[in-house]
Protein backbone atom coordinates (compact mmCIF):
# COMPACT_ATOMS: atom_id res chain seq x y z
CA UNK A 1 0.00 0.00 0.00
CA UNK A 2 1.24 3.50 -0.98
CA UNK A 3 1.88 5.59 1.98
CA UNK A 4 -1.09 8.54 2.82
CA UNK A 5 1.62 10.80 2.42
CA UNK A 6 2.78 10.08 -1.30
CA UNK A 7 -0.94 9.65 -2.47
CA UNK A 8 -0.75 13.24 -4.31
CA UNK A 9 2.35 12.67 -5.97
CA UNK A 10 2.94 11.44 -9.34
CA UNK A 11 4.10 8.37 -9.86
CA UNK A 12 6.79 7.87 -12.90
CA UNK A 13 7.33 4.80 -14.77
CA UNK A 14 9.08 4.09 -17.89
CA UNK A 15 6.66 3.49 -21.05
CA UNK A 16 5.80 3.50 -24.43
CA UNK A 17 3.09 5.56 -25.60
CA UNK A 18 2.74 7.42 -22.72
CA UNK A 19 2.75 10.99 -21.58
CA UNK A 20 1.06 12.37 -25.53
CA UNK A 21 4.49 10.91 -26.64
CA UNK A 22 4.63 8.92 -29.51
CA UNK A 23 8.07 6.98 -28.04
CA UNK A 24 9.49 5.31 -24.54
CA UNK A 25 10.57 7.23 -21.41
CA UNK A 26 9.80 8.01 -18.51
CA UNK A 27 6.42 9.35 -18.04
CA UNK A 28 4.87 10.76 -14.64
CA UNK A 29 1.00 10.54 -13.79
CA UNK A 30 -0.67 11.66 -10.42
CA UNK B 1 20.23 30.84 -8.92
CA UNK B 2 20.09 27.16 -9.58
CA UNK B 3 22.45 24.66 -7.89
CA UNK B 4 23.20 21.22 -6.47
CA UNK B 5 26.14 20.88 -4.08
CA UNK B 6 27.47 17.15 -2.97
CA UNK B 7 29.04 16.25 0.19
CA UNK B 8 30.09 13.04 2.33
CA UNK B 9 32.71 11.36 0.01
CA UNK B 10 35.99 10.12 1.20
CA UNK B 11 38.44 7.27 1.46
CA UNK B 12 36.38 3.98 3.07
CA UNK B 13 37.54 0.72 3.30
CA UNK B 14 35.78 -2.34 1.53
CA UNK B 15 32.94 -3.42 3.36
CA UNK B 16 31.97 -0.65 4.90
CA UNK B 17 29.21 2.47 4.42
CA UNK B 18 29.66 6.04 3.61
CA UNK B 19 26.27 8.22 3.22
CA UNK B 20 26.08 10.85 0.88
CA UNK B 21 24.22 14.44 0.64
CA UNK B 22 23.40 16.69 -2.07
CA UNK B 23 21.71 20.18 -1.06
CA UNK B 24 19.57 21.92 -3.32
CA UNK B 25 18.78 25.55 -3.75
CA UNK B 26 17.68 27.90 -6.29
CA UNK B 27 14.12 25.64 -7.03
CA UNK B 28 11.11 24.22 -5.49
CA UNK B 29 12.91 20.62 -4.27
CA UNK B 30 9.74 18.91 -3.89
CA UNK B 31 8.88 19.26 -7.39
CA UNK B 32 11.15 17.53 -9.36
CA UNK B 33 12.87 14.47 -9.49
CA UNK B 34 16.29 13.33 -8.48
CA UNK B 35 19.25 11.30 -9.31
CA UNK B 36 22.43 9.73 -8.40
CA UNK B 37 24.51 9.47 -11.48
CA UNK B 38 28.82 8.15 -10.71
CA UNK B 39 31.76 8.06 -13.01
CA UNK B 40 34.56 6.03 -12.36
CA UNK B 41 38.33 8.08 -12.90
CA UNK B 42 39.08 8.53 -16.60
CA UNK B 43 35.47 6.52 -17.83
CA UNK B 44 32.29 7.29 -18.68
CA UNK B 45 28.43 7.71 -16.82
CA UNK B 46 26.76 5.53 -15.12
CA UNK B 47 23.29 5.87 -13.90
CA UNK B 48 23.21 5.05 -9.83
CA UNK B 49 19.24 5.90 -8.89
CA UNK B 50 16.29 8.21 -9.00
CA UNK B 51 14.16 9.38 -6.81
CA UNK B 52 10.64 11.01 -7.82
CA UNK B 53 8.41 12.94 -6.04
CA UNK B 54 6.96 9.99 -3.69
CA UNK B 55 9.23 8.05 -1.33
CA UNK B 56 7.97 5.27 -1.89
CA UNK B 57 8.93 5.93 -5.69
CA UNK B 58 12.85 5.31 -6.21
CA UNK B 59 14.25 2.80 -8.38
CA UNK B 60 17.93 1.29 -8.73
CA UNK B 61 20.62 0.19 -10.81
CA UNK B 62 21.26 -3.55 -10.92
CA UNK B 63 24.58 -2.67 -10.32
CA UNK B 64 23.82 -1.18 -6.66
CA UNK B 65 20.09 -2.46 -5.82
CA UNK B 66 20.03 -3.78 -2.05
CA UNK B 67 23.51 -1.80 -0.96
CA UNK B 68 22.11 1.53 -1.81
CA UNK B 69 19.71 3.50 -0.51
CA UNK B 70 18.00 7.04 -1.84
CA UNK B 71 16.15 9.06 -0.34
CA UNK B 72 14.94 12.93 0.20
CA UNK B 73 14.33 14.97 3.08
CA UNK B 74 12.04 18.18 1.26
CA UNK B 75 11.69 20.16 4.45
CA UNK B 76 15.31 20.39 4.18
CA UNK B 77 15.68 20.38 0.23
CA UNK B 78 18.33 17.78 1.01
CA UNK B 79 19.58 14.21 -1.34
CA UNK B 80 20.85 11.34 0.15
CA UNK B 81 22.69 8.11 -0.73
CA UNK B 82 23.45 5.69 1.85
CA UNK B 83 25.73 3.35 0.38
CA UNK B 84 26.36 -0.01 1.78
CA UNK B 85 28.80 -2.99 1.67
CA UNK B 86 31.02 -1.03 -0.91
CA UNK B 87 32.96 -2.16 -3.25
CA UNK B 88 36.66 -1.42 -5.04
CA UNK B 89 34.26 -0.95 -8.41
CA UNK B 90 32.02 1.65 -6.56
CA UNK B 91 35.29 4.38 -6.70
CA UNK B 92 33.96 6.96 -8.60
CA UNK B 93 32.90 10.74 -8.91
CA UNK B 94 29.07 10.63 -7.35
CA UNK B 95 26.56 13.52 -9.05
CA UNK B 96 23.66 14.33 -7.95
CA UNK B 97 21.51 15.43 -10.71
CA UNK B 98 17.79 17.19 -11.53
CA UNK B 99 15.88 15.18 -13.53
CA UNK B 100 13.73 17.81 -15.82
CA UNK B 101 10.12 19.43 -15.12
CA UNK B 102 6.93 18.07 -16.19
CA UNK B 103 5.12 14.69 -17.28
CA UNK B 104 7.81 13.23 -19.03
CA UNK B 105 11.39 14.15 -17.46
CA UNK B 106 13.99 11.86 -19.79
CA UNK B 107 17.04 13.93 -19.26
CA UNK B 108 18.87 14.92 -16.73
CA UNK B 109 19.24 19.27 -16.45
CA UNK B 110 21.01 20.26 -13.83
CA UNK B 111 24.02 19.04 -12.19
CA UNK B 112 26.02 19.22 -9.22
CA UNK B 113 30.05 19.50 -8.64
CA UNK B 114 30.19 15.94 -7.47
CA UNK B 115 31.76 14.36 -4.91
CA UNK B 116 34.51 11.44 -4.62
CA UNK B 117 34.26 8.53 -3.14
CA UNK B 118 37.22 5.98 -3.18
CA UNK B 119 36.91 2.35 -1.91
CA UNK B 120 40.32 1.18 -0.89
CA UNK B 121 41.50 -0.86 1.96
CA UNK C 1 21.15 -3.21 -23.85
CA UNK C 2 24.38 -0.87 -24.44
CA UNK C 3 25.12 2.70 -26.11
CA UNK C 4 27.86 2.73 -28.46
CA UNK C 5 29.77 6.09 -29.59
CA UNK C 6 33.15 6.90 -31.42
CA UNK C 7 35.95 7.07 -28.70
CA UNK C 8 36.83 10.21 -30.74
CA UNK C 9 35.90 12.71 -33.51
CA UNK C 10 38.42 15.77 -34.98
CA UNK C 11 36.94 18.76 -36.53
CA UNK C 12 38.29 21.90 -37.72
CA UNK C 13 37.12 25.42 -36.50
CA UNK C 14 33.77 26.29 -38.17
CA UNK C 15 33.20 22.93 -39.87
CA UNK C 16 30.38 20.74 -38.77
CA UNK C 17 30.93 17.76 -36.27
CA UNK C 18 28.67 14.73 -36.22
CA UNK C 19 28.52 12.74 -32.92
CA UNK C 20 26.47 9.39 -33.26
CA UNK C 21 25.22 7.10 -30.76
CA UNK C 22 23.97 3.18 -31.62
CA UNK C 23 21.90 1.34 -29.74
CA UNK C 24 19.29 -1.36 -30.20
CA UNK C 25 15.86 0.47 -31.31
CA UNK C 26 17.38 3.61 -30.17
CA UNK C 27 15.11 5.49 -32.44
CA UNK C 28 12.22 4.04 -30.31
CA UNK C 29 13.39 5.53 -27.60
CA UNK C 30 14.00 9.70 -26.14
CA UNK C 31 17.92 10.17 -26.40
CA UNK C 32 19.88 13.04 -24.39
CA UNK C 33 23.36 14.32 -25.25
CA UNK C 34 25.42 15.87 -22.17
CA UNK C 35 28.66 18.19 -22.50
CA UNK C 36 31.13 17.37 -20.25
CA UNK C 37 34.42 20.03 -20.71
CA UNK C 38 37.92 18.56 -18.62
CA UNK C 39 37.72 18.64 -14.65
CA UNK C 40 33.93 19.84 -15.35
CA UNK C 41 30.44 18.34 -14.64
CA UNK C 42 28.09 17.30 -17.58
CA UNK C 43 25.80 19.85 -18.97
CA UNK C 44 22.46 19.10 -20.61
CA UNK C 45 22.68 20.31 -24.39
CA UNK C 46 19.82 18.32 -26.50
CA UNK C 47 16.94 16.70 -24.72
CA UNK C 48 13.82 14.16 -26.26
CA UNK C 49 16.15 14.10 -29.72
CA UNK C 50 16.79 17.47 -30.82
CA UNK C 51 15.18 20.47 -28.72
CA UNK C 52 17.97 22.17 -26.96
CA UNK C 53 17.53 23.79 -23.34
CA UNK C 54 17.64 27.27 -22.34
CA UNK C 55 21.00 28.44 -23.32
CA UNK C 56 22.49 26.02 -25.25
CA UNK C 57 23.74 27.71 -28.92
CA UNK C 58 21.62 27.22 -31.99
CA UNK C 59 24.42 25.51 -33.51
CA UNK C 60 24.08 22.32 -31.74
CA UNK C 61 21.15 19.91 -32.90
CA UNK C 62 19.90 16.60 -32.53
CA UNK C 63 18.25 13.62 -34.21
CA UNK C 64 17.13 9.76 -33.72
CA UNK C 65 15.77 7.13 -35.85
CA UNK C 66 16.53 3.42 -36.70
CA UNK C 67 18.81 2.70 -34.38
CA UNK C 68 20.86 5.63 -34.25
CA UNK C 69 21.06 8.93 -32.24
CA UNK C 70 22.94 12.01 -33.77
CA UNK C 71 24.74 14.81 -31.95
CA UNK C 72 25.36 17.60 -35.12
CA UNK C 73 27.13 20.82 -34.25
CA UNK C 74 27.63 23.27 -36.80
CA UNK C 75 30.61 25.75 -37.24
CA UNK C 76 32.23 24.24 -34.11
CA UNK C 77 33.88 26.83 -31.79
CA UNK C 78 37.32 25.93 -30.02
CA UNK C 79 35.10 26.09 -26.90
CA UNK C 80 32.57 23.05 -27.86
CA UNK C 81 36.02 20.92 -27.27
CA UNK C 82 34.75 18.36 -24.79
CA UNK C 83 33.39 15.09 -23.73
CA UNK C 84 29.92 14.01 -25.12
CA UNK C 85 27.66 11.51 -23.71
CA UNK C 86 24.24 10.15 -24.91
CA UNK C 87 21.51 9.24 -22.77
CA UNK C 88 18.16 7.02 -22.83
CA UNK C 89 16.11 4.82 -20.68
CA UNK C 90 15.13 1.53 -21.18
CA UNK C 91 13.52 0.65 -18.66
CA UNK C 92 12.33 2.02 -15.14
CA UNK C 93 15.48 0.53 -13.96
CA UNK C 94 17.72 1.04 -16.40
CA UNK C 95 19.05 4.33 -17.56
CA UNK C 96 21.93 3.67 -20.51
CA UNK C 97 25.25 6.35 -21.11
CA UNK C 98 27.24 6.11 -24.33
CA UNK C 99 30.81 5.05 -23.25
CA UNK C 100 31.33 8.94 -24.63
CA UNK C 101 32.95 10.70 -27.26
CA UNK C 102 36.29 13.48 -27.28
CA UNK C 103 35.36 16.07 -29.30
CA UNK C 104 38.68 17.58 -30.23
CA UNK C 105 38.78 20.63 -32.37
CA UNK C 106 41.89 20.69 -34.72
Known amino acids: RRRRRDTHFPICIFCCGCCHRSKCGMCCKT | QVQLVESGGGVVQPGRSLRLSCAAS????????MHWVRQAPGKGLEWVAV????????YYADSVKGRFTISRDNSKNTLYLQMNSLRAEDTAVYYCARAQEGIAPDAFDIWGQGTMVTVSS | YELTQPPSVSVSPGQTATITCSGDKLGERYASWYQQRPGQSPVLVIYQDSKRPSGIPERFSGSNSGNTATLTISGTQAMDEADYFC??????????FGGGTKLTVL
Open chain 2, 51 to 58: IWYAESNK
Open chain 2, 26 to 33: GFTFSSYG
Open chain 3, 87 to 96: QAWYSSTNVL
